[in-house]
Interface confidence: medium
């Protein structure tokens, strides 16, 4: 609305930087013949670039990534008792952040 | 996978606490009727509930929000030519989170 | 504070029957997954039996397998474990102990104990 | 019925390093927990998921598991560490404890 302006501060860009994300992992990223199962714990803490840039034209991407394997408990049910197992996922962290310009594809004349 | 497990850490679960997480303002929020101008900041940062609880049956919830209103710039393009007006745009931040019970509606029989 | 407290021990003669209760305080009960170990004088822990965090899941050592029966109540913030048909290899100081998480994990946190003794 | 086999007893000097061993059946595929107990108290746990310590536990004890062996490492051993030690997994469909290693610091 365009009401009420007294009382707002000046909006502040969310600049393009790595922020602290929720990462859940889904099961298939342990095993995907088996679905009788569950995963603990089921979500973990990634970094990863968000935010905007100051042109229309480019976009907030991952200049440097590192991959993090963590070790999960993969809780099998087996005759209805659970059999703990480790399992290893491979997290994706953003180190660096950068904008970048898109190309967008001209269509083929 | 279950290979490779040495060199892996125990993952550490993401705890429900609020986080920075980014706002994509939308131009709607800001007038429905027409499309015909931009809107900056395109982004900014809310704080927001995210994480997994310890148990099955209770989901990470919002228990104190507070909104904010904050100033944007409303570009309206006007015969090609840019117009700048303010607009408020009010953001929801989440000031506390906890673990809440996830009521499961029984079927009617 | 949050503890355990165990309770209902004592001698009792072969064959008999004994109902221990562990009281729960300081922590939300229903949340996490609890089980029985055991002690026999001067030997290792053993552990006993398994209840998850709603009661849905029981599993037990094969030693008391059948004579035993786990339970809980989460109104009352109390652990149980209903014994029959003791054996005197059943005499052992028996701890309840809570597991951090609603599927099990590691025991966290013990009660002090409580002595059974089978004996005639 | 799966076993985690412990030797009967350690001993070590004050400030020398301690290790006792837990072996198992492809046990660096489960998750391993170290507990101490001092005479006539409950257990405590001192090492959880292999290598995790719970807070109020000293720095010195650390725990790694890999292949069939789990280790509990106590660095700087101190005279209050004398206890038995035992470590435990939950495997097929059963917490299993280790037969106990008893701790002894040498005077």
């Known amino acids: 609305s365009l009401g009420s302006l007294a009382a707002a501060e000046p909006a502040v860009i969310a600049e393009c930087k790595t922020r602290t994300e929720v990462f859940q992992i889904s099961r298939n990223l342990i095993d995907r013949t088996n679905a009788n199962f569950l995963v603990w714990p089921p979500c973990v803490e990634v970094q990863r670039c968000s935010g905007c840039c100051n042109n229309r034209n480019v976009q907030c991407r991952a200049s440097q990534v590192q991959m993090r394997p963590v070790q999960v408990r993969k809780i099998e049910i087996v005759r209805k008792k659970p059999v703990f197992k480790k399992a290893t996922v491979t997290l994706e962290d953003h180190l660096a952040c950068k904008c970048e310009t898109v190309v967008t594809p001209r269509p083929v004349t | 996978s279950l290979g490779s497990l040495a060199a892996a850490e125990p993952a550490v679960i993401a705890e429900c606490k609020t986080r920075t997480e980014v706002f994509q303002i939308s131009r709607n929020l800001i007038d429905r009727t027409n499309a015909n101008f931009l809107v900056w900041p395109p982004c900014v940062e809310v704080q927001r509930c995210s994480g997994c609880c310890n148990n099955r049956n209770v989901q990470c919830r919002a228990s104190q929000v507070q909104m904010r209103p904050v100033q944007v710039r409303k570009i309206e393009i006007v015969r090609k030519k840019p117009v700048f007006k303010k607009a408020t745009v009010t953001l929801e931040d989440h000031l506390a989170c906890k673990c809440e019970t996830v009521v499961t509606p029984r079927p009617v029989t | 504070e949050v503890q355990l407290v165990e309770s209902g021990g004592g001698l009792v003669q072969p064959g008999g029957s004994l109902r221990l209760s562990c009281a729960a305080s300081?922590?939300?009960?229903?949340?996490?997954?609890m089980s029985w170990v055991r002690q026999a004088p001067g030997k290792g822990l053993e552990w006993v039996s398994y209840?998850?965090?709603?009661?849905?899941?029981?599993y037990y050592a094969d030693s008391v397998k059948g004579r035993f029966t786990i339970s809980r109540d989460n109104s009352k913030n109390t652990l149980y474990l209903q014994m029959n048909s003791l054996r005197a290899e059943d005499t052992a100081v028996y701890y309840c102990?809570?597991?951090?998480?609603?599927?099990?994990?590691?025991?966290?946190?013990w009660g002090q104990g409580t002595l059974v003794t089978v004996s005639s | 019925s799966y076993e985690l086999t412990q030797p009967p007893s350690v001993s070590v000097a004050p400030g020398q390093t301690a290790r006792i061993s837990c072996s198992g059946d492809?046990?660096?595929?489960?998750?391993v927990h170290w507990y101490q107990q001092k005479p006539g108290q409950a257990p405590v746990l001192v090492i959880y998921?292999?290598?995790n310590r719970p807070s109020g536990i000293p720095e010195r004890f650390s725990g790694s598991n890999s292949g069939n062996t789990a280790t509990l490492t106590i660095s700087g051993t101190q005279a209050e560490d004398e206890a038995d030690y035992y470590c435990?997994?939950?495997?097929?469909?059963?917490?299993?404890f280790g037969g106990g290693t008893k701790l002894t610091v040498l005077q």
């Open positions: 102990a809570r597991h951090p998480y609603w599927y099990g994990g590691q025991l966290d946190l």
């Open positions: 300081g922590f939300t009960f229903s949340s996490y997954a």
């Open positions: 209840i998850s965090d709603d009661g849905s899941l029981k």
């Open positions: 492809s046990l660096g595929s489960y998750f």
């Open positions: 998921d292999d290598s």
């Open positions: 435990s997994a939950f495997t097929h469909n059963s917490d299993v």
